[in-house]
Protein backbone atom coordinates (compact mmCIF):
# COMPACT_ATOMS: atom_id res chain seq x y z
CA UNK A 1 0.00 0.00 0.00
CA UNK A 2 1.39 3.37 -1.01
CA UNK A 3 2.25 5.91 1.64
CA UNK A 4 0.00 8.93 1.37
CA UNK A 5 2.78 11.46 1.59
CA UNK A 6 6.54 11.92 1.51
CA UNK A 7 9.07 11.24 4.27
CA UNK A 8 9.61 14.18 6.63
CA UNK A 9 11.97 16.91 5.56
CA UNK A 10 14.87 17.61 7.91
CA UNK A 11 16.75 20.88 7.36
CA UNK A 12 20.19 20.32 5.80
CA UNK A 13 19.63 16.56 5.61
CA UNK A 14 18.78 14.11 2.89
CA UNK A 15 17.41 10.60 3.10
CA UNK A 16 17.98 7.36 1.32
CA UNK A 17 16.54 3.88 1.39
CA UNK A 18 18.88 0.90 1.64
CA UNK A 19 16.43 -1.07 -0.48
CA UNK A 20 12.95 -0.53 -1.85
CA UNK A 21 9.89 -2.59 -1.02
CA UNK A 22 7.78 -4.16 -3.73
CA UNK A 23 5.19 -1.71 -5.00
CA UNK A 24 7.56 1.26 -4.78
CA UNK A 25 7.37 3.65 -7.72
CA UNK A 26 10.32 5.64 -9.05
CA UNK A 27 9.12 8.35 -11.39
CA UNK A 28 10.78 8.60 -14.76
CA UNK A 29 12.13 12.13 -14.63
CA UNK A 30 14.42 13.76 -17.12
CA UNK A 31 16.94 16.56 -16.80
CA UNK A 32 16.24 20.00 -18.16
CA UNK A 33 15.88 19.98 -21.94
CA UNK A 34 14.74 16.36 -22.02
CA UNK A 35 11.46 14.57 -21.39
CA UNK A 36 10.04 11.09 -21.18
CA UNK A 37 9.47 9.50 -24.54
CA UNK A 38 5.86 9.56 -25.76
CA UNK A 39 5.41 5.85 -25.24
CA UNK A 40 7.60 5.83 -22.17
CA UNK A 41 6.71 4.59 -18.74
CA UNK A 42 5.42 7.00 -16.14
CA UNK A 43 7.48 5.27 -13.49
CA UNK A 44 9.56 2.22 -12.71
CA UNK A 45 7.98 -0.26 -10.33
CA UNK A 46 9.65 -2.57 -7.84
CA UNK A 47 7.93 -5.84 -8.55
CA UNK A 48 8.43 -9.56 -8.03
CA UNK A 49 8.00 -12.11 -5.30
CA UNK A 50 9.60 -12.89 -1.95
CA UNK A 51 12.55 -14.62 -3.57
CA UNK A 52 13.36 -12.20 -6.38
CA UNK A 53 12.45 -8.57 -7.00
CA UNK A 54 13.39 -6.22 -9.81
CA UNK A 55 12.40 -2.92 -11.39
CA UNK A 56 9.70 -3.23 -14.02
CA UNK A 57 9.54 -0.70 -16.90
CA UNK A 58 12.46 1.38 -18.07
CA UNK A 59 12.78 5.13 -18.01
CA UNK A 60 13.76 6.78 -21.28
CA UNK A 61 14.38 10.45 -21.94
CA UNK A 62 14.47 12.25 -25.26
CA UNK A 63 15.18 15.83 -26.25
CA UNK A 64 12.14 17.94 -25.45
CA UNK A 65 12.46 19.68 -28.82
CA UNK A 66 11.17 16.54 -30.52
CA UNK A 67 7.61 16.81 -29.22
CA UNK A 68 5.39 19.67 -30.28
CA UNK A 69 2.75 19.22 -27.61
CA UNK A 70 5.28 19.79 -24.86
CA UNK A 71 6.36 23.29 -23.97
CA UNK A 72 9.07 24.42 -21.63
CA UNK A 73 7.92 27.35 -19.56
CA UNK A 74 10.14 29.75 -17.70
CA UNK A 75 10.52 28.46 -14.15
CA UNK A 76 9.86 30.73 -11.20
CA UNK A 77 12.95 32.77 -10.24
CA UNK A 78 13.90 30.53 -7.35
CA UNK A 79 13.82 27.53 -9.68
CA UNK A 80 16.03 28.86 -12.45
CA UNK A 81 19.19 27.61 -10.83
CA UNK A 82 20.05 24.03 -11.73
CA UNK A 83 19.16 21.42 -9.18
CA UNK A 84 22.33 20.28 -7.49
CA UNK A 85 23.23 16.83 -6.34
CA UNK A 86 23.19 16.77 -2.56
CA UNK A 87 26.54 15.58 -1.33
CA UNK A 88 26.76 13.32 1.67
CA UNK A 89 29.35 13.62 4.38
CA UNK A 90 31.31 10.69 2.99
CA UNK A 91 31.23 8.45 -0.07
CA UNK A 92 28.38 5.99 0.18
CA UNK A 93 29.37 2.37 0.19
CA UNK A 94 27.32 -0.17 -1.76
CA UNK A 95 25.27 -2.55 0.30
CA UNK A 96 24.21 -6.02 -0.74
CA UNK A 97 20.49 -5.48 -0.98
CA UNK A 98 19.82 -8.84 -2.56
CA UNK A 99 19.78 -10.27 0.93
CA UNK A 100 16.51 -8.46 1.64
CA UNK A 101 13.64 -10.56 0.25
CA UNK A 102 10.85 -8.60 -1.42
CA UNK A 103 13.08 -5.57 -1.97
CA UNK A 104 14.71 -3.98 -5.00
CA UNK A 105 18.17 -2.51 -5.29
CA UNK A 106 18.77 1.12 -6.12
CA UNK A 107 17.99 1.32 -9.85
CA UNK A 108 20.89 2.27 -12.10
CA UNK A 109 20.79 5.73 -13.63
CA UNK A 110 19.28 6.20 -17.07
CA UNK A 111 20.48 8.51 -19.80
CA UNK A 112 19.59 12.16 -19.20
CA UNK A 113 17.98 11.37 -15.86
CA UNK A 114 16.97 14.30 -13.68
CA UNK A 115 19.20 15.20 -10.76
CA UNK A 116 16.45 14.36 -8.28
CA UNK A 117 14.74 11.03 -7.85
CA UNK A 118 11.10 10.95 -6.87
CA UNK A 119 9.97 7.79 -5.13
CA UNK A 120 6.50 6.80 -4.03
CA UNK A 121 7.09 4.56 -1.06
CA UNK A 122 4.94 1.79 0.37
CA UNK A 123 3.93 1.01 3.92
CA UNK A 124 6.80 -0.52 5.88
CA UNK A 125 9.51 1.35 3.96
CA UNK A 126 12.35 2.72 6.05
CA UNK A 127 14.52 5.63 4.98
CA UNK A 128 17.73 6.79 6.62
CA UNK A 129 18.78 10.39 7.05
CA UNK A 130 22.20 11.97 6.91
CA UNK A 131 23.35 15.57 7.07
CA UNK A 132 24.56 17.13 3.85
CA UNK A 133 28.19 18.07 3.47
CA UNK A 134 29.24 20.86 5.79
CA UNK A 135 26.66 20.00 8.46
CA UNK A 136 27.13 17.94 11.57
CA UNK A 137 24.63 15.40 12.86
CA UNK A 138 23.24 15.66 16.35
CA UNK A 139 21.13 12.65 17.31
CA UNK A 140 18.46 12.34 19.94
CA UNK A 141 17.37 8.99 18.61
CA UNK A 142 17.23 7.03 15.35
CA UNK A 143 18.03 9.02 12.22
CA UNK A 144 15.43 7.10 10.29
CA UNK A 145 11.76 7.24 9.38
CA UNK A 146 9.30 4.46 8.72
CA UNK A 147 6.01 4.65 6.84
CA UNK A 148 3.37 3.12 9.09
CA UNK A 149 -0.32 2.41 8.65
CA UNK A 150 -2.53 3.52 11.53
CA UNK A 151 -6.34 3.43 11.47
CA UNK A 152 -6.36 3.20 7.69
CA UNK A 153 -4.06 6.21 7.27
CA UNK A 154 -0.36 6.24 6.58
CA UNK A 155 2.18 8.36 8.41
CA UNK A 156 5.95 8.65 8.59
CA UNK A 157 7.67 8.48 11.95
CA UNK A 158 9.74 11.54 12.82
CA UNK A 159 13.50 11.06 12.56
CA UNK A 160 15.44 12.30 15.56
CA UNK A 161 18.14 14.18 13.76
CA UNK A 162 19.36 17.76 13.82
CA UNK A 163 22.00 19.01 11.39
CA UNK A 164 24.04 21.93 12.60
CA UNK A 165 26.19 24.14 10.42
CA UNK A 166 29.37 23.95 12.50
CA UNK A 167 31.84 23.80 9.67
CA UNK A 168 34.82 23.45 11.97
CA UNK A 169 33.38 20.30 13.53
CA UNK A 170 32.39 18.60 10.33
CA UNK A 171 34.79 15.70 10.72
CA UNK A 172 33.31 12.26 10.60
CA UNK A 173 32.20 10.79 13.92
CA UNK A 174 35.14 9.24 15.65
CA UNK A 175 37.38 11.91 14.15
CA UNK A 176 36.34 14.82 16.33
CA UNK A 177 38.98 17.24 17.49
CA UNK A 178 40.54 16.02 20.74
CA UNK A 179 38.74 17.23 23.84
CA UNK A 180 40.15 17.54 27.34
CA UNK A 181 37.28 15.54 28.74
CA UNK A 182 33.60 14.89 28.02
CA UNK A 183 32.80 17.33 30.79
CA UNK A 184 34.34 20.05 28.71
CA UNK A 185 31.52 19.87 26.19
CA UNK A 186 28.27 21.78 26.51
CA UNK A 187 25.54 19.62 27.98
CA UNK A 188 23.38 19.79 24.88
CA UNK A 189 26.20 18.43 22.75
CA UNK A 190 27.21 15.72 25.17
CA UNK A 191 23.77 14.16 25.00
CA UNK A 192 23.65 14.25 21.22
CA UNK A 193 26.90 12.66 20.13
CA UNK A 194 26.83 10.64 16.94
CA UNK A 195 28.20 7.20 17.62
CA UNK A 196 30.31 5.25 15.17
CA UNK A 197 27.47 2.76 15.00
CA UNK A 198 25.05 5.47 13.96
CA UNK A 199 27.37 6.54 11.21
CA UNK A 200 27.99 3.03 9.99
CA UNK A 201 24.29 2.48 9.65
CA UNK A 202 24.03 5.64 7.59
CA UNK A 203 26.98 4.85 5.35
CA UNK A 204 25.50 1.47 4.53
CA UNK A 205 22.62 3.17 2.81
CA UNK A 206 23.43 2.84 -0.88
CA UNK A 207 26.04 3.74 -3.40
CA UNK A 208 24.49 6.46 -5.47
CA UNK A 209 23.22 9.19 -3.21
CA UNK A 210 21.66 11.74 -5.52
CA UNK A 211 19.78 14.78 -4.46
CA UNK A 212 16.70 15.24 -2.52
CA UNK A 213 15.56 12.02 -4.08
CA UNK A 214 12.26 13.21 -5.46
CA UNK A 215 10.39 14.15 -8.65
CA UNK A 216 7.23 12.95 -10.37
CA UNK A 217 5.60 12.91 -13.71
CA UNK A 218 2.29 12.05 -15.22
CA UNK A 219 1.63 12.74 -18.79
Amino acid sequence: ELCDDDPPEIPHATFKAMAYKEGTMLNCECKRGFRRIKSGSLYMLCTGNSSHSSWDNQCQCTSSATRNTTKQVTPQPEEQKERKTTEMQSPMQPVDQASLPGHCREPPPWENEATERIYHFVVGQMVYYQCVQGYRALHRGPAESVCKMTHGKTRWTQPQLICTGEMETSQFPGEEKPQASPEGRPESETSCLVTTTDFQIQTEMAATMETSIFTTEYQ
Partner: antibody, heavy 114, light 107 residues
Amino acid sequence: QVQLQQPGAELVRPGTSVKMSCKAAGYTFSNYWIGWVKQRPGHGLEWIGDIHPGGGYINYNEKFTGKATLTADTSSSTAYMQLSSLTSEDSAIYYCVSRNFANWGQGTLVTVSA
Amino acid sequence: DIQMTQSQKFMSTSVGDRVSVTCKASQNVGTNVAWYQQKPGQSPKALIYSASYRYSGVPDRFTGSGSGTDFTLTISNVQSEDLAEYFCQQYNSYPWTFGGGTKLEIK
Protein backbone atom coordinates in the same frame (compact mmCIF):
# COMPACT_ATOMS: atom_id res chain seq x y z
CA GLN B 1 -2.21 14.81 4.32
CA VAL B 2 -2.07 15.68 0.63
CA GLN B 3 -4.86 18.04 -0.38
CA LEU B 4 -5.84 19.64 -3.67
CA GLN B 5 -8.35 22.46 -3.20
CA GLN B 6 -10.48 23.66 -6.08
CA PRO B 7 -13.31 26.21 -6.22
CA GLY B 8 -16.69 24.54 -6.45
CA ALA B 9 -18.20 26.21 -9.50
CA GLU B 10 -17.76 28.80 -12.24
CA LEU B 11 -20.60 30.22 -14.35
CA VAL B 12 -19.30 31.80 -17.56
CA ARG B 13 -20.59 33.21 -20.83
CA PRO B 14 -19.99 31.59 -24.21
CA GLY B 15 -16.97 32.99 -26.02
CA THR B 16 -15.25 34.11 -22.84
CA SER B 17 -12.46 32.52 -20.81
CA VAL B 18 -12.25 31.04 -17.35
CA LYS B 19 -9.22 30.45 -15.17
CA MET B 20 -9.59 27.89 -12.41
CA SER B 21 -7.22 27.15 -9.57
CA CYS B 22 -5.91 24.14 -7.71
CA LYS B 23 -4.14 24.84 -4.42
CA ALA B 24 -1.90 22.03 -3.23
CA ALA B 25 -0.95 21.28 0.37
CA GLY B 26 0.73 18.47 2.26
CA TYR B 27 3.57 17.76 -0.14
CA THR B 28 6.41 19.48 -1.98
CA PHE B 29 4.52 21.25 -4.75
CA SER B 30 7.51 21.86 -7.02
CA ASN B 31 8.43 18.16 -7.09
CA TYR B 32 5.25 16.74 -8.55
CA TRP B 33 3.33 17.06 -11.77
CA ILE B 34 -0.16 18.51 -11.54
CA GLY B 35 -2.56 17.15 -14.12
CA TRP B 36 -6.04 18.16 -15.21
CA VAL B 37 -8.93 15.87 -16.13
CA LYS B 38 -12.29 16.75 -17.71
CA GLN B 39 -15.49 14.88 -16.89
CA ARG B 40 -18.70 15.31 -18.83
CA PRO B 41 -21.78 13.11 -18.40
CA GLY B 42 -21.76 10.51 -21.14
CA HIS B 43 -18.19 11.35 -22.12
CA GLY B 44 -16.27 9.78 -19.25
CA LEU B 45 -12.90 11.14 -18.13
CA GLU B 46 -10.47 12.93 -20.44
CA TRP B 47 -6.88 13.84 -19.62
CA ILE B 48 -6.21 17.46 -20.62
CA GLY B 49 -2.55 17.86 -19.76
CA ASP B 50 -0.18 18.48 -16.90
CA ILE B 51 2.51 20.77 -15.64
CA HIS B 52 5.68 20.32 -13.62
CA PRO B 53 5.88 23.39 -11.37
CA GLY B 54 9.57 22.91 -10.59
CA GLY B 55 10.92 21.66 -13.89
CA GLY B 56 9.02 24.07 -16.08
CA TYR B 57 7.41 21.59 -18.47
CA ILE B 58 3.85 21.43 -19.73
CA ASN B 59 2.25 18.55 -21.63
CA TYR B 60 -1.04 18.81 -23.47
CA ASN B 61 -3.39 16.25 -24.90
CA GLU B 62 -3.46 17.43 -28.53
CA LYS B 63 -7.25 17.55 -28.35
CA PHE B 64 -6.96 20.41 -25.85
CA THR B 65 -4.11 22.34 -27.46
CA GLY B 66 -5.37 25.89 -27.96
CA LYS B 67 -8.26 25.34 -25.59
CA ALA B 68 -6.41 24.87 -22.28
CA THR B 69 -3.44 26.79 -20.89
CA LEU B 70 -1.71 25.44 -17.80
CA THR B 71 0.36 27.53 -15.40
CA ALA B 72 1.66 27.18 -11.86
CA ASP B 73 2.80 29.50 -9.09
CA THR B 74 5.26 27.83 -6.75
CA SER B 75 5.13 30.67 -4.22
CA SER B 76 1.49 29.88 -3.47
CA SER B 77 1.62 26.16 -4.38
CA THR B 78 -1.20 26.73 -6.83
CA ALA B 79 -1.76 25.39 -10.32
CA TYR B 80 -4.08 27.08 -12.80
CA MET B 81 -5.91 26.07 -15.93
CA GLN B 82 -7.39 28.63 -18.29
CA LEU B 83 -9.99 27.59 -20.84
CA SER B 84 -10.62 29.95 -23.73
CA SER B 85 -13.35 30.54 -26.33
CA LEU B 86 -15.84 28.69 -24.20
CA THR B 87 -18.77 26.80 -25.68
CA SER B 88 -21.37 24.49 -24.22
CA GLU B 89 -19.00 21.61 -24.97
CA ASP B 90 -16.74 22.97 -22.25
CA SER B 91 -19.41 22.64 -19.59
CA ALA B 92 -17.99 19.93 -17.36
CA ILE B 93 -16.32 19.15 -14.07
CA TYR B 94 -12.56 19.76 -14.15
CA TYR B 95 -10.36 17.93 -11.67
CA CYS B 96 -6.76 18.58 -10.80
CA VAL B 97 -4.70 15.53 -9.91
CA SER B 98 -1.25 14.98 -8.48
CA ARG B 99 1.25 12.35 -7.37
CA ASN B 100 0.67 9.97 -10.29
CA PHE B 101 -3.11 10.35 -10.07
CA ALA B 102 -3.15 9.20 -6.46
CA ASN B 103 -4.68 12.48 -5.30
CA TRP B 104 -7.64 14.25 -6.86
CA GLY B 105 -9.18 17.62 -6.13
CA GLN B 106 -12.91 17.92 -5.53
CA GLY B 107 -13.39 19.38 -8.99
CA THR B 108 -14.65 22.67 -10.38
CA LEU B 109 -17.99 22.61 -12.19
CA VAL B 110 -17.82 24.94 -15.16
CA THR B 111 -21.14 25.92 -16.66
CA VAL B 112 -21.12 27.80 -19.96
CA SER B 113 -24.41 29.58 -20.39
CA ALA B 114 -25.71 32.75 -21.96
CA ASP C 1 -4.45 7.18 -28.94
CA ILE C 2 -4.92 4.01 -26.93
CA GLN C 3 -8.57 3.15 -26.37
CA MET C 4 -9.60 1.65 -23.06
CA THR C 5 -12.88 -0.23 -23.43
CA GLN C 6 -15.13 -1.17 -20.53
CA SER C 7 -17.73 -3.20 -22.37
CA GLN C 8 -20.17 -3.40 -19.49
CA LYS C 9 -21.67 -0.01 -18.71
CA PHE C 10 -23.73 -1.41 -15.85
CA MET C 11 -23.34 -4.38 -13.56
CA SER C 12 -25.76 -5.56 -10.94
CA THR C 13 -24.69 -7.51 -7.88
CA SER C 14 -25.76 -8.31 -4.36
CA VAL C 15 -24.08 -7.63 -1.03
CA GLY C 16 -21.65 -10.44 -0.29
CA ASP C 17 -21.22 -11.39 -3.94
CA ARG C 18 -18.08 -11.29 -6.03
CA VAL C 19 -18.01 -9.13 -9.14
CA SER C 20 -15.41 -8.55 -11.85
CA VAL C 21 -15.16 -5.34 -13.87
CA THR C 22 -13.19 -5.73 -17.09
CA CYS C 23 -11.20 -3.33 -19.23
CA LYS C 24 -9.54 -3.92 -22.59
CA ALA C 25 -6.75 -1.81 -24.08
CA SER C 26 -6.51 -1.33 -27.85
CA GLN C 27 -2.80 -2.14 -27.67
CA ASN C 28 -0.29 -3.55 -25.21
CA VAL C 29 0.08 -1.28 -22.19
CA GLY C 30 2.07 -3.68 -20.02
CA THR C 31 0.85 -3.26 -16.47
CA ASN C 32 0.56 0.52 -16.71
CA VAL C 33 -3.08 0.57 -15.70
CA ALA C 34 -4.90 2.15 -12.79
CA TRP C 35 -8.44 1.73 -11.45
CA TYR C 36 -10.59 4.44 -9.89
CA GLN C 37 -13.84 4.43 -7.95
CA GLN C 38 -16.23 7.34 -8.25
CA LYS C 39 -19.22 7.57 -5.96
CA PRO C 40 -22.15 9.83 -6.89
CA GLY C 41 -21.28 13.49 -6.34
CA GLN C 42 -17.65 12.77 -5.48
CA SER C 43 -14.32 12.96 -7.25
CA PRO C 44 -12.64 9.75 -8.39
CA LYS C 45 -10.64 7.85 -5.81
CA ALA C 46 -7.53 5.88 -6.77
CA LEU C 47 -7.87 2.17 -5.97
CA ILE C 48 -5.19 0.31 -7.93
CA TYR C 49 -1.95 1.22 -9.68
CA SER C 50 0.28 -0.88 -11.93
CA ALA C 51 -2.65 -3.21 -12.59
CA SER C 52 -2.51 -5.00 -9.24
CA TYR C 53 -1.14 -2.79 -6.45
CA ARG C 54 -3.58 -1.29 -3.96
CA TYR C 55 -3.37 2.27 -2.72
CA SER C 56 -3.32 2.80 1.03
CA GLY C 57 -6.68 2.61 2.74
CA VAL C 58 -8.23 0.53 -0.05
CA PRO C 59 -9.92 -2.58 1.40
CA ASP C 60 -8.29 -5.84 0.39
CA ARG C 61 -11.55 -7.03 -1.16
CA PHE C 62 -10.50 -4.91 -4.17
CA THR C 63 -8.05 -6.81 -6.36
CA GLY C 64 -6.59 -5.83 -9.70
CA SER C 65 -5.12 -8.21 -12.24
CA GLY C 66 -4.05 -8.46 -15.86
CA SER C 67 -1.32 -7.29 -18.20
CA GLY C 68 -0.93 -6.47 -21.85
CA THR C 69 -4.42 -5.68 -23.08
CA ASP C 70 -6.84 -7.34 -20.64
CA PHE C 71 -7.42 -6.07 -17.11
CA THR C 72 -9.84 -6.92 -14.33
CA LEU C 73 -10.91 -5.26 -11.12
CA THR C 74 -12.45 -7.84 -8.80
CA ILE C 75 -14.52 -6.92 -5.79
CA SER C 76 -15.06 -9.85 -3.48
CA ASN C 77 -17.66 -9.74 -0.71
CA VAL C 78 -19.33 -6.67 -2.22
CA GLN C 79 -20.53 -4.11 0.31
CA SER C 80 -23.29 -1.53 -0.07
CA GLU C 81 -20.69 1.25 0.01
CA ASP C 82 -19.16 -0.17 -3.18
CA LEU C 83 -22.08 1.32 -5.15
CA ALA C 84 -20.10 3.50 -7.56
CA GLU C 85 -18.74 3.85 -11.06
CA TYR C 86 -15.37 2.25 -11.79
CA PHE C 87 -12.91 3.54 -14.38
CA CYS C 88 -9.72 2.06 -15.75
CA GLN C 89 -6.90 4.21 -17.10
CA GLN C 90 -3.72 3.56 -19.07
CA TYR C 91 -0.57 5.59 -18.56
CA ASN C 92 1.67 3.65 -20.89
CA SER C 93 1.52 6.08 -23.79
CA TYR C 94 0.42 9.69 -24.34
CA PRO C 95 -2.19 10.86 -24.05
CA TRP C 96 -3.30 9.05 -20.94
CA THR C 97 -6.75 7.62 -21.57
CA PHE C 98 -9.62 6.31 -19.45
CA GLY C 99 -12.23 3.66 -19.94
CA GLY C 100 -15.85 4.74 -20.27
CA GLY C 101 -16.75 3.49 -16.81
CA THR C 102 -18.79 0.66 -15.34
CA LYS C 103 -21.58 1.48 -12.91
CA LEU C 104 -22.02 -1.05 -10.14
CA GLU C 105 -25.58 -1.38 -8.88
CA ILE C 106 -26.46 -3.17 -5.68
CA LYS C 107 -29.60 -5.33 -5.84
